[in-house]
Interface confidence: medium
């Protein structure tokens, strides 16, 4: 019995659902009562899901698997794996037995996009040409391990004095911290790129350092120039710092975080103590770091509605404030492609190709091209609908007149994450008889 599975690994984003395709060719007169279907982990032989004695025997794998019962009789033995985790990565074997027996293994490759890197500088003030500075590039919650690259403002790769560490959290996702030590010239731009080798997703950030003396007078409050990019559901740190003078104590500090536009209070520290979150109980300061001038705010379980500008007010004797922008993002799923009509196609027929990608933010850019890489812009209609959480589902429809055959590719780009997700369909028109 010939059992067919895809040669290439199935790539699935953490938290999404994946389909492990498996098919066989039922003979005439085949009935499900004859079918024994077993999915198991290839290495450990652990049972995942089974169908026997004419019945779906259910999931033996954390209740996260399902078959496609309506399609089994046509030879579709595919397995749906829900809410994919890093631990699911590996090989799954599909065993099919009717009269004969056959099996094949399909690989699941798990992936998660890395966040836009945040850049920090140490020391971050009173910098002069000739000073040595440490630039830290941090990117969060990606999988698998990232490749990290640095370069200067002229595009020259920087490989010396770079130390990169990658730590996996409880879910197996990696936080990447790459440290570059440089001696300052008159000024300089330093860029860090974090690349996900599976998703071919690049996330990069730059810092431009202009050595100079800090102005005196009011409290100098420092926040990142670039927006802080946070994935929906993750935690974000809105960085804010000030320079405490000798003899500074927390009793002197008034710290207020508020929404820049509406002035709504978010979090405060006054009279020597943390006054707590005034923002859905999802914010926290870093109390142990306040005395060193770290007034950063932690925002937990980020939602689309959190996007916007937050102002950090610091008052000691003098007063200073600065605003930091939060840009929320969510990766788009790999597009699914559908064809209408999808059979008995002939050259000259008009077909509608729909490219659908789900649960991303912000709105996507959608591009189409043919097999020669030529952009297709005519006869394209794209709609984007936000769900209750503010995440967008994208549906882009291309109408084409078939040639002898052709490949049509759709790319859904998340402009914030610089994440590209694409799907292709190859149509081979049947010649006229």
């Amino acid at each position: 019995l010939e059992v067919q599975v895809p040669e290439d690994p199935v790539v699935a984003l953490v938290g999404t659902d994946a389909t492990l395709c498996c098919s066989f060719s039922p003979e005439p007169g085949f009935s499900l009562a004859q079918l024994n279907l077993i999915w198991q982990l290839t290495d450990t032989k652990q049972l995942v899901h089974s169908f026997a004695e004419g019945q779906d025997q259910g999931s033996a794998y954390a209740n996260r698997t399902a078959l496609f019962p309506d399609l089994l009789a046509q030879g579709n033995a595919s397995l749906r794996l829900q809410r994919v985790r890093v631990a699911d990565e590996g090989s799954f074997t599909c065993f099919v037995s009717i009269r004969d027996f056959g099996s094949a293994a399909v690989s699941l490759q798990v992936a998660a996009p890395y966040s836009k890197p945040s850049m920090t500088l140490e020391p971050n003030k009173d910098l002069r040409p000739g000073d040595t500075v440490t630039i830290t590039c941090s990117s969060y919650q990606g999988y698998p391990e990232a490749e990290v690259f640095w370069q200067d403002g002229q595009g020259v790769p920087l490989t010396g004095n770079v130390t990169t560490s990658q730590m996996a959290n409880e879910q197996g996702l990696f936080d990447v911290h790459s440290i570059l030590r440089v001696v300052l010239g008159a000024n300089g731009t330093y860029s860090c790129l974090v690349r996900n080798p599976v998703l071919q997703q690049d996330a990069h950030s730059s810092v431009t350092i202009t050595p100079q003396r800090s102005p005196t007078g009011a409290v100098e409050v420092q926040v990142p120039e670039d927006p802080v990019v946070a994935l929906v559901g993750t935690d974000a740190t809105l960085r804010c710092s000030f320079s405490p003078e000798p003899g500074f104590s927390l009793a002197q500090l008034n710290l207020i975080w508020q929404l820049t536009d509406t002035k709504q209070l978010v979090h405060s520290f006054t009279e020597g103590r943390d006054q707590g979150s005034a923002y859905a109980n999802r914010t926290a300061l870093f109390p142990d770091l306040l005395a060193q001038g770290n007034a950063s705010l932690r925002l937990q379980r980020v939602r689309v509605a959190d996007e916007g500008s937050f102002t950090c007010f610091v008052s000691i004797r003098d007063f200073g404030s600065a605003a930091v922008s939060l840009q929320v993002a969510a990766p788009y799923s790999k597009p699914s492609m559908t064809l209408e009509p999808n059979k008995d196609l002939r050259p000259g027929d008009t077909v509608t190709i729909t490219c659908s990608s789900y649960r991303g933010y912000p709105e996507a850019e959608v591009f189409w091209q043919d097999g020669q890489g030529v952009p297709l812009t005519g006869n394209v209609t794209t709609s984007q609908m936000a769900n209750e959480q503010g995440l967008f589902d994208v549906h882009s429809v291309l109408r084409v007149v078939l040639g002898a055959n052709g490949t049509y590719s759709c790319l859904v780009r998340n402009p914030v994450l610089q994440q590209d997700a694409h799907g292709s369909v190859t149509i081979t028109g049947q010649p006229m008889t």
């Epitope: 490749e147 690259f149 370069q151 403002g153 002229q154 595009g155 020259v156 790769p157 490989t159 860029s191 790129l193 690049d202 990069h204 730059s206």
Partner: antibody, heavy 121, light 106 residues
Framework: EVQLVQSGAEVKKPGASVKVSCKAS????????MHWVRQAPGQGLEWMGG????????TYNQKFKGRVTMTRDTSISTAYMELSRLRSEDTAVYYC??????????????WGQGTTVTVSS | DIQLTQSPSSLSASVGDRVTMTCSAS?????MHWYQQKPGKAPKLLIY???KLASGVPSRFSGSGSGTDFTLTISSLQPEDFATYYC?????????FGGGTKVEIK
């Protein structure tokens, strides 16, 4: 159409200087770093350095430091490469080449047609 | 500096042949790029980031490899493919090219 058009062939005497120009068209000149690569007769390719047209920052191959100067004139979308104290082994075809647009594209996607520089007494 | 050694330095092949050439780096690099150059012409980008096909390049060209060993393959040699091929790295400054592989008609 994206194009890099270089100045014509030059014949120079040893010890002289040569300045080769490269005019860009079909794209925004300041958005791509421009590099220079040379090729001696019957030999391979040798990287000389590059210039960021946006702010004029340069990077040079150590081998040419002190002899090569790269400049640009953004008003006419032109990059220049000047090589001084010429010697016979500098006889080569000199190419300008555009670095890929993304910051971390470390390859050259568009090349000029080349300028032949002959150094002979 | 990272040295790139291409082999063979030249090869003879016929139209339709499968042709493979290699580029070996003196230390590990992140990506390799490949160019094609015909006599009297400027080089042309063929493959970038080890395995990605440059715009307009036929799919018979492919690249692979990692670390120090990289390969350029032409699956079915065509008359217009007779040329010299160069590899290039810039994972570590300075940027360097290989010495080239010349593909000639048998």
């Amino acid at each position: 159409e994206v194009q890099l058009v270089q100045s014509g062939a030059e014949v120079k005497k040893p010890g002289a200087s040569v300045k080769v120009s490269c005019k860009a068209s079909g794209y925004t000149f300041t958005e791509y770093i421009m590099h220079w690569v040379r090729q001696a007769p019957g030999q391979g390719l040798e990287w000389m350095g590059g210039i960021n047209p946006n702010q004029g920052g340069t990077t040079y191959n150590q081998k040419f430091k002190g002899r090569v100067t790269m400049t640009r004139d953004t008003s006419i979308s032109t990059a220049y490469m000047e090589l001084s104290r010429l010697r016979s082994e500098d006889t080569a075809v000199y190419y300008c080449a555009r670095k890929g647009k993304d910051y971390f594209d470390w390859y050259f996607d568009v090349w000029g047609q080349g300028t032949t520089v002959t150094v002979s007494s | 500096d990272i040295q790139l050694t291409q082999s063979p330095s030249s090869l003879s092949a016929s139209v339709g042949d499968r042709v493979t050439m290699t580029c070996s780096a003196s230390s590990s690099v992140s990506y390799m790029h490949w160019y094609q150059q015909k006599p009297g012409k400027a080089p042309k980008l063929l493959i970038y980031d080890t395995s990605k096909l440059a715009s307009g390049v036929p799919s018979r060209f492919s690249g692979s490899g990692s670390g120090t060993d990289f390969t350029l393959t032409i699956s079915s040699l065509q008359p217009e493919d007779f040329a010299t091929y160069y590899c290039q790295q810039w994972s570590s400054a300075p940027l360097t090219f290989g010495g080239g592989t010349k593909v000639e008609i048998k």
